[in-house]
């Protein structure tokens, strides 16, 4: 199970992990206490039939050609979570493990 | 953590989940044992903005607006496995789980 | 409709090779076992061995395993059962049968359709 | 090899009677087992697979019971059509092997 990774200098059209950095402060988004910002990355590219397909079913899918099934697209296929501290909306200060705000890697799916 | 199901007849545009039976026999998949066919589903539709994201990560990126970042399309959120009865490529019959197989969920990353 | 349709009565001498075919029709034929099983005059089942067509792998009960052979036509969708140096106690009606799986474990299936059965007698 | 004991080998009823066939195998079979029906001249007919269940088509005056060793093939209510030769198939291993079979005869 692997993945592409690019950065903004590749000619790569194909389904890739980019870098990105999240930043909170520049949102707005002063409930978030800490981090203020940190590197999330995302996927961008192009789904050519079978390259990088997370699951089977992907292309069965494609086999099938169910009416409207637009192909599989460049989304995450594994993330992992960042810790952060945040007030709630009661204004409570919250310590926790935020889910999926890393993309480790991207696929078609 | 919801997702719409929809049916051939469903006017439905946003991002859903569609029945569909994968036929192994229909493909030719002969080294298939067993099942011939499976109750496989798919995921078709459009994502507006914000509309079913599984993750805090999709919203963090479309508000970071990164070049190439296509926004978020529909695809499974929530696989299930199937058991499968097969020949692998040594003739050899092999009974397992094979993993997301089956759309349980479907979703916009 | 799933048919199996097997070929006609045979009279052997001892020593002798015979071989039964089964065209099977309405189904596809690569992708089911067939299974081969034999009746002596007035007695019980017995079960030889089985072949599936997609790749020609095959298992064979071990009381027949030197003598038997099982192969498939995958052009005309016919399974063959040849068994060689026949003796009297050979004499049998032979039948062929598709193994139809109902779930997805390895003894998850039964036997849902059967040929009409090819007597073959073995005398001097 | 799996031994397959069926019993009785031949039996006697009269229509409209409940009979009850039984076959029991030499280890546990983990409920895979399958009865079929025969007519003289005739290829065998599957009835019930995985020890309890009717294949489509087959009336439900055939039912199927048991598991481990011991199982059993219960018909509610004789008709003229059932008088035949009933056998028991375990599936669980290699080779499949069979019982001997019942000699179902009207009385």
């Known amino acids: 199970d692997f993945g592409l990774d690019c950065d903004e200098h590749s000619t790569e059209s194909r389904c890739c992990r980019y870098p990105l950095t999240v930043d909170f402060e520049a949102f707005g988004w002063d409930w978030i206490i800490a981090p203020k910002r940190y590197k999330a990355n995302y996927c961008s590219g192009e789904c050519e039939f079978v390259f990088l397909q997370k699951y089977p079913h992907t292309h069965l899918v494609h086999q099938a050609n169910p009416r409207g099934s637009a192909g599989p697209c460049c989304t995450p296929t594994k993330m992992s979570p960042i810790n952060m501290l945040y007030f709630n909306g009661k204004e409570q200060i919250i310590y926790g493990k935020i889910p999926a705000m890393v993309v480790d890697r991207c696929g078609c799916s | 953590d919801f997702g719409l199901d929809c049916d051939e007849h469903s006017t439905e545009s946003r991002c859903c989940r569609y029945p569909l039976t994968v036929d192994f026999e229909a493909f030719g998949w002969d080294w298939i044992i067993a099942p011939k066919r499976y109750k496989a589903n798919y995921c078709s539709g459009e994502c507006e903005f914000v509309f079913l994201q599984k993750y805090p990560h999709t919203h963090l990126v479309h508000q970071a607006n990164p070049r190439g970042s296509a926004g978020p399309c529909c695809t499974p959120t929530k696989m299930s496995p199937i058991n499968m009865l097969y020949f692998n490529g040594k003739e050899q019959i092999i009974y397992g789980k094979i993993p997301a197989m089956v759309v349980d969920r479907c979703g916009c990353s | 409709q799933v048919q199996l349709v097997q070929s006609g009565a045979e009279v052997k001498k001892p020593g002798a090779s015979v071989k039964v075919s089964c065209k099977a029709s309405?189904?596809?034929?690569?992708?089911?076992?067939m299974h081969w099983v034999r009746q002596a005059p007035g007695q019980g089942l017995e079960w030889m061995g089985n072949i599936y067509p997609y790749n020609g792998v095959s298992n064979y009960n071990q009381r027949f395993k030197a003598r038997v052979t099982m192969t498939v036509d995958k052009s005309t969708s016919t399974a063959y059962m040849e068994l060689r140096s026949l003796r009297s106690d050979d004499t049998a009606v032979y039948y062929c049968?598709?193994?139809?799986?109902?779930?997805?474990?390895?003894?998850?299936?039964?036997?849902?359709?059967w040929g009409q059965g090819t007597l073959v007698t073995v005398s001097s | 090899d799996i031994q397959m004991t069926q019993s009785p080998s031949s039996l006697s009823a009269s229509v409209g009677d409940r009979v009850t066939i039984t076959c029991k195998a030499s280890q546990d079979i983990n409920s895979y087992l399958s009865w079929f029906q025969q007519k003289p001249g005739k290829a065998p007919k599957s009835l019930i697979y995985?020890?309890?269940r009717l294949v489509d088509g087959v009336p439900s005056k055939f039912s199927g019971s048991g598991s481990g060793q011991d199982y059993t093939l219960t018909i509610s209510s004789l008709q003229p059509e059932d008088f035949a030769t009933y056998y028991c198939?375990?599936?669980?291993?290699?080779?499949?092997?069979f019982g001997q079979g019942t000699k179902l005869e009207i009385k």
């Open positions: 995985r020890a309890n």
């Open positions: 198939l375990q599936s669980d291993e290699f080779p499949l092997t």
């Open positions: 049968a598709r193994r139809y799986y109902y779930g997805t474990g390895p003894a998850d299936w039964y036997y849902d359709v």
């Open positions: 309405g189904y596809s034929f690569t992708g089911y076992f």
